[in-house]
């Protein structure tokens, strides 16, 4: 079953996907698509990287992380209810039937009537609560993990930690990750 991620209408949604390049700059083609991962490719492709660069993208879909280090997490800008659904991240590892694929379910909620504090909204948009646990090889099953609930009193602490990049690294290490090589 798909791992579920949530965002509100008007926010940016974040769908994590990572791999570890065999060597720096030794990138693997990746595609993102709307719809569950089919046997090949990514259904309706919205973004694609090759061995060097992002070589195809459509409006509102972009990679915010350092894809050259294997962070191929997808950001969808200014989401609407129509963005709900399953997305496919496919890491196209060369060889015989080597692809790794991840189905991620995005649930878009209507915007709250009372705007939430900016910091909290930014945090929840950038780092969803539900993450897949880190895998240690292509054969390992990705399982579902959960971050603890975050309340308002924690936001300033979290913001400081984000500035230090410590939490960002921890969250990255909790993402769906594939080691190549």
């Amino acid at each position: 079953s798909e791992v579920e991620y949530r965002a509100e209408v008007g926010q940016n949604a974040y769908l994590p996907c990572f791999y570890t390049p065999a060597a720096p700059g030794n990138l693997v083609p990746v595609c993102w698509g709307k719809g569950a991962c089919p046997v090949f490719e990514c259904g309706n492709v919205v973004l694609r990287t090759d061995e060097r660069d992002v070589n195809y993208w459509t409006s509102r879909y972009w990679l915010n992380g350092d894809f050259r280090k294997g962070d191929v997490s997808l950001t969808i800008e200014n989401v609407t209810l129509a963005d709900s659904g399953i997305y496919c991240c496919r890491i196209q590892i060369p060889g015989i039937m080597n692809d790794e694929k991840f189905n991620l379910k995005l649930v878009i909620k209507p915007a709250k009537v009372t705007p939430a504090p900016t910091r909290q909204r930014d945090f929840t948009a950038a780092f969803p609560r539900m993450l897949t646990t880190r895998g240690h090889g292509p054969a390992e099953t990705q399982t579902l993990g959960s971050l603890p609930d975050i309340n308002l009193t924690q936001i300033s602490t979290l913001a400081n930690e984000l500035r230090d990049s410590r939490l960002a690294n921890d969250l990255r290490d909790s993402g769906a990750t594939i080691r190549i090589g």
Epitope: F40, Y56, Q92, G95
Partner: antibody, heavy 122, light 107 residues
Framework: EVKLVESGGGLVQPGGSLRLSCAAS????????MAWVRQAPGKGLEWVAN????????YYLDSLKSRFTISRDNAKNSLYLQMNSLRAEDTAVYYC???????????????WGQGTLVTVSS | DIQMTQSPSSLSASVGDRVTITCRAS??????LAWYQQKPGKAPKLLVY???TLAEGVPSRFSGSGSGTDFTLTISSLQPEDFATYYC?????????FGQGTKLEIK
Amino acid sequence: EVKLVESGGGLVQPGGSLRLSCAASGFTFSDYYMAWVRQAPGKGLEWVANINYDGSSTYYLDSLKSRFTISRDNAKNSLYLQMNSLRAEDTAVYYCARDVGYYGGNYGFAYWGQGTLVTVSS
Amino acid sequence: DIQMTQSPSSLSASVGDRVTITCRASDNIYSYLAWYQQKPGKAPKLLVYNAKTLAEGVPSRFSGSGSGTDFTLTISSLQPEDFATYYCQQHYGSPLTFGQGTKLEIK
């Protein structure tokens, strides 16, 4: 006009080898996954193998992957199937087919060649 | 492997009839299903892809529906050239698999 033309079929003894070719025209060959599908006489369709745009990723029917190798030459707009250690049960018409394109979306074998008959018999 | 089961295996019908062929997948394949028509001695021809999208040049009397595990191909009014064998095929899991075929014959 999209055209796929297979060649290389024929009669071969059990244990022998054959190399099938498929010449493609009428589309940008390197923008599509390509496939081989076979059909034994009087039987249904069976997928054999697929290959991605540049040949770096290949996909096979499990029972065939130790004997069959799919490859492509984008400079020649050609697809190949190397078949080794052939068995009587490999007797079939082998079709070359165009699969999904670079931007996904259309999941089906949109174009097929006319097929080439491979007969494995002593 | 995902098994694709078509029914019926054969079907007799007359010109002008409405005909429905069903295909059931052993697992969820979302909408990654295609339908093909094959005539004796000829290559298959794509009719429908992604479960319900009509392929280029296919007459509008053909239509596809369904998602998940249950799919149908409908011919709204049979024409003489429609008598053939029809196959469904999934593009979701490896290996790609076809149904066993439905032979549509003249009554």
